[in-house]
């Protein structure tokens, strides 16, 4: 059962796992949600009736029954983790806490003009978890405007105290706002021999990397595969750090793999969701329950639905035994990872999918489909929408992409002459325009947000957001596409597709079926040569074949240039402009979305 409200002047008795310090009860709830075992918490607010050393304590709790006895206590605020809820969860915390000093290791001190600048510095520093900034009014002259960057082993403060004229806050890395590089490569036959901050068991290097990503102190990792010569170290995942933030020591060693935390790209790849099955693999841990199940998929569902289950092992049924049902062992551990991993015993193991909701919805894999030709199939591009105008008559105006449950990203030039959002309709989950009838459901548009530097498509800033009047319920046929991570600026995309209902040639009509074309990206230098009369800026991206023949065209505007990278689709471009359509040596020009991520997040995350 999902309980989101906080219980004032209430304390949960017993079940303590650990105590951390948080600046608010709301953030305590987030910490509890992300902790592998926490189901409930009690937070102590500042209060004259409470011992100041207990202010801001956040006690994380667990219970076999998923609840604990309640006791009345002034200044105590209690609640439940969001693990029990089905809604999307985020660790992003933009709050600034006034007159609070969050204690940690002060590893960097510098002058900053504002708290915002201090927070940005923290966000772009690999080690920083949170900061404290002494304002202009701070009593001590030499400490005024000082920005202290801090880190701790847990990522949360070691203590929080009241201190006049300072403000504190957290790094915004988990809000996708970091400019740090996103290094996705996994290096085979490599050991990083720097300091270990922790070690866990993992079935493969990808899970090890994802564990590193959501571990507060891990910057890179080394994983020993199941072929590693030393049996006691097989499947061992070493979580590592270094002062410089990079490995100082790389040693060639067979059957080991190493890689980096994906903290700076976590919004465009799954980091909590370990969805694979591991065959002939047994996960050991504390047993929660043993239930009969028809398949390993059914076992995973049972684990996902049991709030305390973290991972499972399924042993298939022996022939004609127990109505063909195997045994499903639901398990847990103190850190959410198996305590040991064994191979060759016939089990099939995996993890709960309950944590998938902590990842961005856009990272979910699309069910593979057999596709060919230029017409799309249903559900192939579930982020693609058709934007209609109803004035003077209803017609397709532009394409667009779902990027959030209330947000469509499209091109600014689509709204030339559009006086009001009232005349707009957004249709999602559509394959054929002919599906749209009088009674077809649509999303009304509450607000059109055009980039304030937009003048015309050819001069750039051709980007706009539509805020929908109601939220989109994600399904297989309508869900978001990931924005590229700012740390991904150097990624070379090789699998890019432009989609839309636009013209098939310059003098044509809107197509009934959503069309798709695979188009290679072109460097900006190359693109500039093809458009001597225009300035191709770094905020634009070009795509097209030298010989022409495939391109976006009239009516595709605002739609996505979607590129697949590491099994996840990213919205790399927005169809903007070009000279004619599919002409030889005239690539299509698209708005370069990665350059607008800050703008998008600023507009969509505004309180």
């Amino acid at each position: 059962e999902c309980v989101t409200q906080l219980l004032k002047d209430t304390c949960f008795e017993g079940g303590d796992i650990t105590t951390v310090f948080t600046p608010s009860a709301k953030y305590c709830q987030v910490v509890c949600t992300y902790h592998p075992r926490c189901l409930l918490f009690t937070f102590t607010a500042e209060s004259p009736s409470e011992d100041p050393t207990r202010w801001f304590t956040c006690v994380l709790k667990d219970s076999v029954t998923e609840t604990l006895p309640r006791v009345n206590r002034t200044a105590a605020i209690s609640g439940y983790s969001f693990k029990q809820c089905s809604h999307q969860i985020s660790a992003c915390n933009k709050d600034i806490y006034v007159d609070l000093d969050m204690k940690g290791i002060n590893y960097n001190s510098s002058v900053a003009k504002s708290a915002q600048e201090c927070q940005e510095r923290c966000t772009d520093d690999v080690h920083c978890h949170f900061f404290t900034y002494a304002t202009r009014q701070f009593p001590s002259l030499e400490h005024r405007n000082i920005c202290l960057l801090k880190h701790t082993q847990t990522g949360t403060p070691t203590r929080i105290t009241k201190l006049d004229k300072v403000v504190s806050g957290f790094s915004l890395k988990s809000c996708a706002l970091s400019n740090l590089a996103c290094i996705r490569d996994i290096f085979p036959n490599t050991v990083f021999a720097d300091s270990n901050i922790d070690s866990v068991m993992a079935p493969d290097a990808f899970v090890c990397g994802r564990i590193c990503t959501h571990h507060p102190g891990c910057l890179f990792f080394t994983f020993f595969s199941q072929e590693w010569p030393k049996e006691s170290q097989r499947n061992l995942c070493l979580l590592k750090t270094s002062e410089s933030g990079l490995p100082s020591t790389r040693i060639k060693k067979s059957k080991a793999l190493s890689g980096f935390s994906l903290q700076s790209c976590r919004h465009s790849i799954p980091v909590f969701c370990h969805s694979s099955f591991y065959h002939d693999t047994d996960f050991l841990g504390e047993e929660l329950d043993i239930v009969a199940a028809k398949s390993h998929e059914a076992c995973q569902k049972l684990c996902t639905n049991a709030v305390r289950c973290q991972f499972f092992t399924y042993t298939p049924a022996q022939a004609s035994c127990n109505e063909g049902k195997g045994k499903c062992y639901l398990k847990l551990s103190s850190n959410g990872s198996p305590t040991k991993i064994l191979h060759g015993r016939g089990g099939i193991s995996g993890y709960t999918l309950r944590l998938c909701k902590m990842d961005n919805e856009c990272t979910t894999k699309i069910k593979p489909r057999i596709v060919g030709g230029t017409a799309s199939v249903r559900g192939e591009w579930p982020w693609q929408v058709t934007l209609h105008t109803t004035s003077p008559t209803q017609r397709h105006l532009c394409g667009g992409s779902i990027i959030g449950n209330q947000w469509i990203l499209t091109a600014a030039h689509c709204f030339y002459g559009v006086e009001s959002p009232k005349i707009l309709r957004v249709y999602s989950g559509i394959l054929n325009q002919s599906e749209i009838k009088e009674d077809t459901s649509f999303f009304g548009v509450q607000e059109i947000i055009i980039h304030d530097q937009y003048k015309m498509a050819e001069s750039g800033y051709d980007i706009a957001l539509l805020k929908l009047e109601t939220t989109v319920n994600y399904t297989d046929s309508q869900r978001p596409i990931c924005l590229p991570s700012k740390g991904d600026r150097n990624v070379i995309y090789t699998d890019c597709w432009v989609t839309g209902w636009g013209y098939r040639k310059l003098r044509d009509k809107i197509q009934n079926t959503l069309q798709k074309a695979k188009i290679p990206l072109v460097t900006n230098e190359e693109c500039q040569k093809r458009y001597r009369g225009h300035k191709i800026t770094h905020k634009m991206i070009c795509a097209g074949y030298r010989e022409g023949g495939k391109d976006a065209c009239k009516g595709d505007s605002g739609g996505p240039l979607s590129c697949k990278h590491n099994e996840v689709w990213h919205l790399v471009g927005i169809t903007s402009w070009g000279e004619g359509c599919a002409q030889r040596e005239r690539p299509g020009v698209y708005t370069n979305v990665v350059e607008y991520v800050d703008w998008i997040l600023e507009k969509t995350q505004a309180v």
Epitope: V191, F192, A193, D194, S195, N196, I197, S199, T222, P229, K230, E231, S232, Q233, L236, L238, K240, I251, K252, K253
Partner: nanobody
Framework: QVQLVESGGGLVQPGGSLRLSCAAS????????MAWYRQAPGNECELVST???????YYADSVKGRFTISRDNSKNTLYLQMNSLRAEDTAVYYC????????????????????WGQGTLVTVSS
Amino acid sequence: QVQLVESGGGLVQPGGSLRLSCAASEFTFDDSDMAWYRQAPGNECELVSTITSDGGTYYADSVKGRFTISRDNSKNTLYLQMNSLRAEDTAVYYCAADQWGSAEGDCTSSYPGGYWGQGTLVTVSS
């Protein structure tokens, strides 16, 4: 009980040499990757050199060309020949087996299957 026992440390003048030894027992030495780490007072644990089971070697930049790691599998012994010693080489030197990195920057704690010796002090001073 796995044991790693270091010897050969002591006081030496700058420019001098020392040879450290590490005698290993109770585990398959020839299948293990061996390493020398060091920790100076108030500093993090630092990897000095490794030698893998198949003979591959690695040296930290600060010791390259001055230190040589070797092993004698028949004697279950690891060596570190240290030449042209400098004051900044002063530290406690630890022998380690299958220990890829130290925990919390401290040369004493192991994860599964990794082992440390108790350390030998090397002091370089005139």
